[in-house]
Interface confidence: low
C-alpha cells in the first residue's frame, strides 16, 4: 500500500494554519488499525504517533519551510512511508505603514502620555518597527514582534517633543516608511503678571494708564480679562501667544485691586493684586495715583 | 490644594483579600496616572502597578500581578486596590501616588495592612 | 527590570556640614527624544510619607529649599545637600521612571 502526505493548503502563508494528512488511497484506514506520525526534515512533529491520520499545525512561519513526510504503523509493526513534500511557507511583505497617536489629532498636554503606534495594514513574521523623530529623523527606538502593531510611549511629554515623527516597518523585503504625523504640545498658561504703566512717574486724573497683563508659558491663542476689585473690564486677544494690554482713562474712582486672568482653554490663571491709591501730594493742586 | 487620603490601617485574616482606597482631590483626577507603592517595616519601596484613571487601563510590576488588581472610580475621584490571598509577607503600607512629569509628586498617607489570625 | 543601587546606605553628618549620595542605575536614564534623565529622589522622614525632592534628575520641586541639588547624567547620579539641617534627617530615595518604576534600597541620614 502506497501513503502520501497532503498538506493543505499546499502554499500557505505566514501566520496561517494547515493541515497535514496520511492518506492511503487503496486501503481505507478503518480497515486495519494504523498509527500515524508526522515529520518535517529529521524531527516528529506534534503528538509524535497517533491514531489520527490528521495534523493541524495552528500557525506555519517562515522557518517551518521544509520538507515533510509521514508514516503508518500498522499492529503488526510494519511501517509504510510517503514521500518527502516541500512546503513553502510565504512571507506577506510589509504594507500601508501609517503612524497614530493616542491621544488622536497628535494634540497632547504638557506632562500626559504621548503613544506612537505604529501600524501595518499587512505583513507576516517578525515585523521590526522603527520610530523616528523630526523629518531628518533622530531614531528613537525599534521594536520586533509578530503583530501589525507596536507603541513606543512618551510616558510624560514636554515642550521638547512638538516634532514631526514617523515609523518604518521592515520584514524582510527593505523598509517601508509611514507618513509624518505632527506632535503639538499643548501647554497650560502659568499665572500671569500684570504690570502698570503709565505716562509719568505719578499718573493722574484724565491720564490713560496701560494694564498689561502676560503669563509667560501657555499654549496660543490666549485670552486675557481684566478686573478692577470684581468687575470686568473688558478683554484682549493675544492670538500668538505673548501678552495684551488695557487702556484705562483715570478717574478718582479708578482707585482699588486691579488682577488680570490668563485662559488659553486648557485652565485659567489669575495675577497677583495690584492695589491703586490717589494720593494728594502736600502743596500739589492735583490728585495723583500710587502703585 | 492636592489631596490623596486613605485610611490608616486595615486589619486582616490570611487568606482573605482586601480592598484599599485613595480619594483624590484638588485636582482632575482623570490627567494623571496613579501608581501604588508597597513598604514593608523597615524596607524599602516595592512599585506594585500603575492605573490611568481616564482609560481604566492598568500596569502591572510583573511580581505583583497575580496579587494585585487596579480600579478606579471617575464619579468618585477613587483609586482602589484589591490584594487577595493574604499572607504575612502582605503585612506592609501601601501608598497611592500622583504621577506628574513621570515623577510621583503627591502621596497619600498610606494604609497600614497587618495580615494576622 | 532597571536595577537602582545607592550608597552609603547610612551616614551620620554634624548640622551645618555638606553631604553627597550615590545612585547608580543598570542602565542609561537619559531619554534621547528630550535629553532628560528620568530619575526622581524622595525624602522619608519618620512615620512620613515619600516627598518628591528633584525629578528629571537636577529640576527641584517647588517648595523644596535650595540647599537641596540633584546632578549626574546616563547612569551615575548624586544628591547633594549644601548645609544640613537637623530636620533632614529621613531616608532618601533614588527612583528612575525611564521604564516601569524602581527605586534604590535608600540612604539614611543621620544627625549627629
Known amino acids: 500500500a502506497e501513503l502520501f502526505l497532503i498538506a493543505s493548503p499546499s502554499h500557505p502563508t505566514e501566520g496561517s494554519p494547515v493541515t497535514l494528512t496520511c492518506k492511503m488511497p487503496f486501503l481505507q484506514s478503518s480497515d486495519a488499525q494504523f498509527q500515524f506520525c508526522f515529520f518535517r526534515d529529521t524531527r516528529a512533529l506534534g503528538p509524535g504517533w497517533s491514531s489520527s491520520p490528521k495534523l493541524q499545525i495552528a500557525a506555519m512561519w517562515k522557518e517551518d519551510t521544509g520538507s515533510y513526510w509521514c508514516e503508518a504503523q500498522t499492529m503488526a509493526s510494519k511501517v509504510l512511508r510517503s514521500r518527502r513534500s516541500q512546503i513553502n511557507v510565504h512571507r506577506v511583505p510589509v504594507a500601508d505603514v501609517s503612524l497614530e497617536t493616542q491621544p488622536p489629532g497628535g494634540q497632547v498636554m504638557e506632562g500626559d502620555r504621548l503613544v506612537l503606534i505604529c501600524s501595518v495594514a499587512m505583513g507576516t513574521g517578525d515585523i521590526t518597527f522603527l520610530w523616528y523623530k523630526g523629518a531628518v529623523g533622530l531614531n528613537l527606538q525599534s521594536k520586533t514582534q509578530r503583530s501589525l502593531t507596536a507603541e513606543y510611549e512618551i510616558p510624560s511629554v514636554r515642550e521638547s517633543d512638538a516634532e514631526q515623527y514617523y515609523c518604518v516597518a521592515e520584514n524582510g523585503y527593505g523598509p517601508s516608511p509611514s507618513g509624518l504625523v505632527s506632535i503639538t504640545v499643548r501647554i497650560p498658561v502659568s499665572r500671569p503678571i500684570l504690570m502698570l504703566r503709565a505716562p509719568r512717574a505719578q499718573a493722574a486724573v484724565e491720564d490713560v494708564l496701560e494694564l498689561h497683563c502676560e503669563a509667560l508659558r501657555g499654549s496660543p491663542p490666549i485670552l486675557y480679562w481684566f478686573y478692577h476689585e470684581d468687575i470686568t473690564l473688558g478683554s484682549r486677544s493675544a492670538p500668538s501667544g505673548g501678552g495684551a494690554s488695557f487702556n484705562l482713562s483715570l478717574t478718582e474712582e479708578h482707585s482699588g485691586n486691579y488682577s488680570c486672568e490668563a485662559n488659553n482653554g486648557l485652565g485659567a490663571q489669575r495675577s497677583e493684586a495690584v492695589t491703586l491709591n490717589f494720593t494728594v501730594p502736600t502743596g500739589a493742586r492735583s490728585n495723583h495715583l500710587t502703585s | 490644594q492636592v489631596q490623596l487620603q486613605q485610611p490608616g490601617a486595615e486589619l486582616v485574616k490570611p487568606g482573605t483579600s482586601v480592598k484599599l482606597s485613595c480619594k483624590a482631590s484638588?485636582?482632575?483626577?482623570?490627567?494623571?496616572?496613579m501608581h501604588w507603592v508597597k513598604q514593608r517595616p523597615g524596607q524599602g519601596l516595592e512599585w506594585i502597578g500603575r492605573?490611568?484613571?481616564?482609560?481604566?487601563?492598568?500596569k502591572y510590576n510583573e511580581k505583583f500581578k497575580s496579587k494585585a488588581t487596579l480600579t478606579v472610580d471617575k464619579t468618585s475621584s477613587s483609586a482602589y486596590m484589591q490584594l487577595n490571598s493574604l499572607t504575612s509577607e502582605d503585612s506592609a503600607v501601601y501608598y497611592c501616588?500622583?504621577?506628574?512629569?513621570?515623577?510621583?509628586?503627591?502621596w497619600g498617607q498610606g494604609t497600614s495592612v497587618t495580615v494576622s489570625s | 527590570d532597571i536595577v537602582m543601587s545607592q550608597s552609603p546606605s547610612s551616614l551620620a553628618v554634624s548640622v551645618g556640614e555638606k553631604v553627597t549620595m550615590s545612585c547608580k542605575s543598570s542602565?542609561?536614564?537619559?531619554?534621547?527624544?528630550?535629553?532628560?534623565?528620568?530619575l526622581a529622589w524622595y525624602q522619608q522622614k519618620p512615620g512620613q510619607s515619600p516627598k518628591l525632592l528633584i525629578y528629571?534628575?537636577?529640576t527641584r520641586e517647588s517648595g523644596v529649599p535650595d540647599r537641596f541639588t540633584g546632578s549626574g547624567s546616563g547612569t551615575d547620579f548624586t544628591l547633594t545637600i549644601s548645609s544640613v539641617k537637623a530636620e533632614d534627617l529621613a531616608i532618601y530615595y533614588c527612583?528612575?521612571?525611564?521604564?516601569?518604576?524602581?527605586f534604590g534600597s535608600g540612604t539614611k541620614l543621620e544627625i549627629k
Open positions: 501616588t500622583r504621577v506628574n512629569s513621570g515623577a510621583m509628586d503627591y
Open positions: 484638588g485636582y482632575t483626577f482623570t490627567r494623571y496616572w
Open positions: 492605573i490611568d484613571p481616564n482609560s481604566g487601563g492598568s
Open positions: 542602565q542609561s536614564l537619559l531619554y534621547s527624544s528630550n535629553q532628560k534623565n528620568y
Open positions: 528629571w534628575a537636577s
Open positions: 527612583q528612575q521612571y525611564s521604564n516601569y518604576p524602581t
